[in-house]
Every structure is written in C-alpha cells, then in structure tokens.
C-alpha cells in the first residue's frame, strides 16, 4: 500500500547513512530514520545510485547491490510519506564507497570466468600494465553455498594469462543458478589494485563434449545417437553436427536445436541421450562424425560457448583408391 | 614449430593506408600476446603494438597511437596491423613477433614484410 | 620511457675470443630485460630473456648478468655465425624499449 497521509511539508533527511562490504561485492548501505519526521507519516526510503539509476521507494532502511567494486559507487537516500514516486522526498543524503587504494595500471584485467560443466569454474586474467612480471596472484571466491569467502588454490598460467580453478557443482536447489559467484584477484604482496568481478551462473557455461553412442545407415540416411555431457539435460542445449564424407571430401555442419529419438530407427528411453538424422548419406564410403553442444537461452543467459567435440566416429568403408 | 608470416607490405603514398598480416601456426595462439616490431632501413628495433591473447587489450608506441590500429582474428590464427596516415617515417620492415608470456620478451619473429611511404 | 644504451656501438673480434656487450638503462628494472641477435636482412633471434636465462635452442655460449640498470651479454667463444648486431630491450615498463644496437665485426 501506500501508506498513511502526505503531508506537503518534505520530511526531514535520514540519519547515520553507513556503508559497509560483505562477501566480496555486496555492498550494503543501512540508514537511521529521519528525526523529527511527522507522526502522521507513515516513512518510506527513496533511493538511487549516483548515476540516477535503479530508483526504488521502500519501507527497509538499508539497501544491498552486487557489484564488482572496480569504481566508486554512490547511494543516495531520501524519506517520504508515500510510495508516489512524483512526492518530492527529503533532500538526499548521500554515501560513497571506494574501491580498494592502488595504481589503476597494476590492476589485472580481462578477468573472465567460465563454469565448466556446471562442475568446475575456471577464471583467467591478464597481469595490469604496470605489474613486475614476477607477480604472484591470489584468486578468492565467494557464492552464496559458502559460509565464506575461499581462497583459489590451483593457480596455473597459460601463455600470457593467468588462471585458477575450482570446483563448483550444481545444486539441487532450483534458485542455486539465479545467483552470482564473486571473484577478487590481488597479488600476494598486496602491490597491486584488486580486481572484482561478479559472475552470474547462469552466463559463460562451457559444458563438456557430448559421446556418441551409435552411428547406423536407413537407406541413404545416417542415424546418429549421442549421449549428452552430465548435469545438461537435452532440451538446455543445441548441437552442431558435423560429417566428413572420405570419398566425395564434403564436409557438412548441421546446426540443430532439437535432437529427440523419436524415430524407431533410435534406441528408445536411454537417459540423456540425443538423435539426429543426416538425409543423403551414401552408406557405401567412409563417413566421419563429430558433435559439439552449447548452452541455448531457453535454460541459460549466454549461448556463445561451445563445447569441445566429441571424439570422432566413423560408419561405412573406405574405398581402394584405383 | 612455431611460424609467423607476415604479408601486405608496400610502397604507399602519405596519407595512405595499409593492412599488414601475420599468419602463425605452431603454438596455441588464442593465448598468447601478440606483437608488431618495425625497423627503419639502417636503423635499430622499434616497438610499435601490442594486442592481448583474447584481443581484448591493446597499447601503442606514441609514435603510432591514434594511427594504427592492432586486432586479431583468433579463428584464423592471425595478426593484423591497420596503418591509417602514413608519414615517411613509417617506413621500415614490419616484424610480427609472439611475446612469451604479457609484459615480456619476443620468443618468436616472423621474417618481416617492407612497408614503404613516398610518393 | 627507460633509455636503454648500449655500448660499445660496435665491436671487431676474431673467432675464439670472448666477448662483452653491455647494456644500462635510464632506471632500474629489476631483471627485466632480453638480448636478441640479427643477422643482415633477417628477422632477429631471441637469445636471452630475463636478464640470464637462456632461450631454449640457444648454444650455452651465449650467457646474460646483471640486475637494475646495467646488464651484459657475454660470448665465451665466438664462432664464425655469431658475427651480428645485439639488441638489448626491457619489459618492466610499458612501453617496450630497445637498445640501439651492437654490431660485432670480423677483426
């Protein structure tokens, strides 16, 4: 509801407006209602970020964002006796928060993480511009299955980029995926300005290459049957499969969004499995498949992360040249 | 064996533009930063650009920065170098050279291609 | 930028002997710093990186010291191929800079 009456005076401003940090990036601010406010006044919170965005009118003296903190970050806060949006609140108080001190140029950059498989997150960065080459990097990890903040232990480097690793497995709890895994990298010797990053688990989601189980021919079509990777279930994920003809050396990509084994030709009732028929297959040459998936943005936000492929297949005979 | 080829040097007019490749194979190149070297004819190694391995970061020498522009396309293996407002003093052997790891040394060179800027 | 200079600017020296070329730079950068050889009209060569370590490939002749600002390549024993101009280059600062070059002639 609204609340009670509104007067037209504007009520006064709130007091002790603090910030503080939990996790990695959750920024929390929590304020003190304003003193003096009228008695017919039933308070409500006006709020918005420095850059006027994600204005919200509430009842709670505090308010939260994930955020990775690599920039400052302003709240401002105001009372008022309505939800009305077009009620002008008290003047507002603001509150910043900063990141870290350090050289902007020391941060590390292009950190990414991408969550293999929905087992294991693999996060990779690039050292900052103003960085000693003989760096050495912590990674920690915060998500909401944790009590608390972990520290990456299986620090690896590939050619220029840095990396680390850890297991993450989904589970069952169906709200697990509308959550966030926080990152912070910093260096050991606390040189360098830390970086944040706030990965959603239901973006950058590699899984693993799907195993074919079963090639077989029907007249001049190839019935192919694969077993999709574990923790996907099939209708999560789109196909790209591909068949290499050894004799006429064609090499054709189908792009295919629903597998069912519908058809008699497939094994029926296996767990997790997918099918697909290729017309116009000539039974009698040497045909070669692999099969590779992604995530489609009917159970994920991001669809750009293939697997690897499959281990190849083949069906038929090769031809003696002559 | 890692190798890099360059190509797409030529004789050019100032205020011309010009794109130079580096073809590489040999190593994983979506991982590595990537980088073009010049040298003046009778001159010494001069640094010109830098492009990270995911083509996300790149730097320029001050002498080139608003002029050239560095990118790379990960599917094919290759380094590009954008030469827009060529001067005289552009003209040199282009190098492609693979860095070792980021802020680093030059582990790999390709052979070079000849840009030349006069009219 | 870090200057980086080497000296001398060119050296004549026969086969067998040992050789010397050194290389300071403008302010320290800790070991930061690789050698490379050219030869006329190729692409130059790594030789050492991190101010000692040898590239792999590379014959142990060719060794790298020192830290800060000043730094050495040294040839125990030169052989006939290593007739070339040295380059000096640091990487502990954007942006990257090279020596001006050493070229060892043939005495």
């Known amino acids: 509801g609204g609340g009670g009456a509104a007067p037209t005076e504007t009520q006064p401003p709130v007091t002790n407006l603090s910030v503080s940090v939990e996790n990695l990036c959750t920024v929390i601010w929590t304020w003190n209602p304003p003193e003096g406010a009228s008695s017919n006044c039933s308070l409500w919170y006006f709020s918005h970020f420095g850059d006027k965005q994600d204005k919200k009118i509430a009842p709670e003296t505090r308010r939260s964002i994930e955020v990775p903190l690599n920039e400052r970050i302003c709240l401002q806060v105001g009372s008022q006796c309505s939800t009305n949006e077009s009620e002008k609140p008290s003047i507002l108080v603001e509150k910043c928060i900063s990141p870290p001190e350090g050289d902007p140029e020391s941060a590390v950059t292009e950190l990414q993480c991408i969550w293999h498989n929905l087992s294991y997150m693999k996060c990779s960065w690039l050292p900052g511009r103003n960085t000693s080459p003989d760096t050495n990097y912590t990674l920690y990890y915060w998500h909401r299955s944790l009590e608390k903040i972990h520290q990456c232990e299986n620090i690896f480097r590939e050619g220029q980029y840095f990396g680390c690793s850890f297991d993450l497995t989904k589970v069952k709890d169906s709200s697990f995926e509308q959550h966030s895994v926080q990152i912070m990298v910093k260096d050991n010797a606390g040189k360098i300005k830390p970086s944040f990053n706030i990965v959603p688990l239901t973006s950058r989601v590699k899984p693993d290459p799907p195993h074919i189980k079963n090639l077989s021919f029907h007249n001049d079509d190839l019935y192919v049957q694969w077993e999709n990777p574990q923790n996907f279930i099939s209708r999560c994920l789109f196909y790209e499969v591909e068949v290499n003809n050894s004799q006429t050396e064609t090499h054709n990509v189908f792009y295919v969004q629903e597998a069912k084994c519908e058809n008699p030709e497939f094994e029926r009732n296996v767990e997790n499995t997918s099918c697909f028929m290729v017309p116009g297959v000539l039974p009698d040459t040497l045909n070669t498949v692999r099969i590779r998936v992604k995530t489609n943005k009917l159970c994920y936000e991001d669809d750009k992360l293939w697997s690897n492929w499959s281990q190849e297949m083949s069906i038929g005979k090769k031809r003696n040249s002559t | 064996e890692v190798q890099l080829l360059e190509s797409g040097g030529d004789l050019i007019q100032p205020g011309g533009s010009l794109r130079l490749s580096c073809a590489a194979s040999?190593?994983?190149?979506?991982?590595?930063?990537m980088n073009w070297v010049r040298q003046a004819p009778g001159k010494g190694l001069e640094w010109v650009s830098v492009i990270s391995g995911r083509g996300i970061t790149t730097y320029y020498a001050d002498s080139v920065k608003g002029r050239f522009t560095i990118s790379r396309d990960n599917s094919k293996n290759t380094l590009y170098l954008q030469m827009d407002s060529l001067r005289a003093e552009d003209t040199a052997v282009y190098y492609c050279a693979k860095g070792s790891s980021y802020w680093t040394d030059f582990d790999y060179w390709g052979q070079g291609t000849l840009v030349t800027v006069s009219s | 930028d870090i200057q980086m200079t080497q000296s001398p600017s060119s050296l004549s020296a026969s086969v067998g002997d040992r050789v010397t070329i050194t290389c300071r730079a403008s302010q320290g950068i800790s070991s930061w710093l690789a050698w490379y050889q050219q030869k006329p009209e190729k692409a130059p060569k790594s030789l050492i990186y991190a101010a000692s370590s040898l590239q792999s490939g590379v014959p142990s002749r060719f060794s790298g010291s020192g830290s800060g600002t000043d730094f050495t390549l040294t040839i125990s024993s030169l052989q006939p191929e290593d007739f070339a101009t040295y380059y000096c280059?640091?990487?502990?600062?954007?942006?990257?800079?090279f020596g001006q070059g050493t070229k060892v002639e043939i005495k």
């Open positions: 040999g190593f994983t190149f979506n991982i590595y930063a």
């Open positions: 280059q640091q990487y502990n600062s954007y942006p990257w800079t």
